[in-house]
Amino acid sequence: DPESSIFIEDAIKYFKEKVSTQNLLLLLTDNEAWNGFVAAAELPRNEADELRKALDNLARQMIMKDKNWHDKGQQYRNWFLKEFPRLKSELEDNIRRLRALADGVQKVHKGTTIANVVSGSLSISSGILTLVGMGLAPFTEGGSLVLLEPGMELGITAALTGITSSTMDYGKKWWTQAQAHDLVIKSLDKLKEVREFLGENISNFLSLAGNTYQLTRGIGKDIRALRRARANLQSVPHASASRPRVTEPISAESGEQVERVNEPSILEMSRGVKLTDVAPVSFFLVLDVVYLVYESKHLHEGAKSETAEELKKVAQELEEKLNILNNNYKILQADQEL
């Protein structure tokens, strides 16, 4: 069936780009994981068998290509186990600070700008590497805070013209549009540097299987979306004879699949840093744009609730990230004790 083989091709492309060697092996060696995946993907038996064969081949290729993936993974796991307690403490500091900002609590030193209250809280230290891995890159350039998601290098620059980041005036300090522009550009440069430094290694570090059920269900849902989208494309009258490249299936519970066709994927945008695992368990939970830029909102009655809500949202994002990291830390600790 040509339709089925086109779907298998798309599925393999997805696994190549989005699933780590370790998680692919988990899927292929754990029957429960495989069955969970097949169920979540709603694959008919014949397609499941065909995909299984193709994935067996892919796994062999991946292992051949990266013989020391296991060692590298272990190396990054050890690094994470060592660094996490300190990072956890830093993240908790950040969460507390963001909550205090949201509540509008006065900081001891007079004339402190909100920006300065946050600066230092997300310090540029070795912890930044993990924060990039979590999907949040923090920067305190110029005393203000910007949180950027991986793969945003391209999209943001275009939007910069419309951005003013006057942060929030608390001590009569103003941030001009030019400074904001400069701040974001510098932050993007730093983000690129860090990402290039991490390179492919990030995928080994991040391939922590974690919750098998979540993992298989997550991949399954993406494959299901991809399969439905393929079916929808086939049913469109006058569809182009040449097959369009489907890069990013958008998982949705409803049947309304919005496919992005012929666009560079986030994977391609993020300069060789491979997204591993899938959304439910990945540290690379790709957020919509998570960065703090304020349009000269004052901490007075007018914009108080608006800015408070923004800050609470950022705090919540950090809390979610910390929970994911915490869970992975526990899993890794338990693995080590076995």
Partner: antibody, heavy 121, light 107 residues
Amino acid sequence: QIQLVQSGPDLKKPGETVKISCRTSGYAFTNYGVNWVKQAPGKGLKWMGWINTNTGQTTYAEEFRGRFAISLETSASTAFLTISNLKNEDSATYFCARLIYDGDYISSDFWGQGTTLTVSS
Amino acid sequence: DIQMTQSPDSLSASVGETVTITCGASENIYGALNWYQRKQGKSPQLLIYGATNLADGMSSRFSGSRSGRQYSLKISSLHPDDVATYYCQNALSMPYTFGGGTKLEIK
């Protein structure tokens, strides 16, 4: 030295209004928030709300929204708690306390001596 | 709102003993927890802030610790002067709720 001095005990009738003052000294008033805490006889502490002495922004705990208002007289370094339409259950000792935030943690480091309010017909 | 559950409600111990009071938060408060001491007829006094930091002027016999959402206040080598009611407080976000209090008595 740092001090928060509250107004004296008060006896009021239900339906009346009371305004409790908290005069501060020994520190820069507008650098620290002021919060209010209630303790009914035989009960624990209840956080009522606070005021940002710099901006005048207030936040109240759910059960203290409506009849309770926290205000300032910055020139006199004084915070006020006003309770209107008094009820018998408002009988309690009310404390004002300085809210300190050092960039890491928030706490109430200096407290007033407390104001005992009795509401009785 | 974040709920703070303190235990025990009351306890009685002898001079020189070590006692521990615990406080649980209904959600993660990331170490933003304070302990206050309120002696009979006096205003509350800050004892511990940020779960583990001893407030200025307080005896080092008091110490705070944290394990996940559970927080503890340890009073070692109990003194008669420690007779008071102890309260924990969420200091992460408003409202800054208090625990129900633990009344400490000397046997």
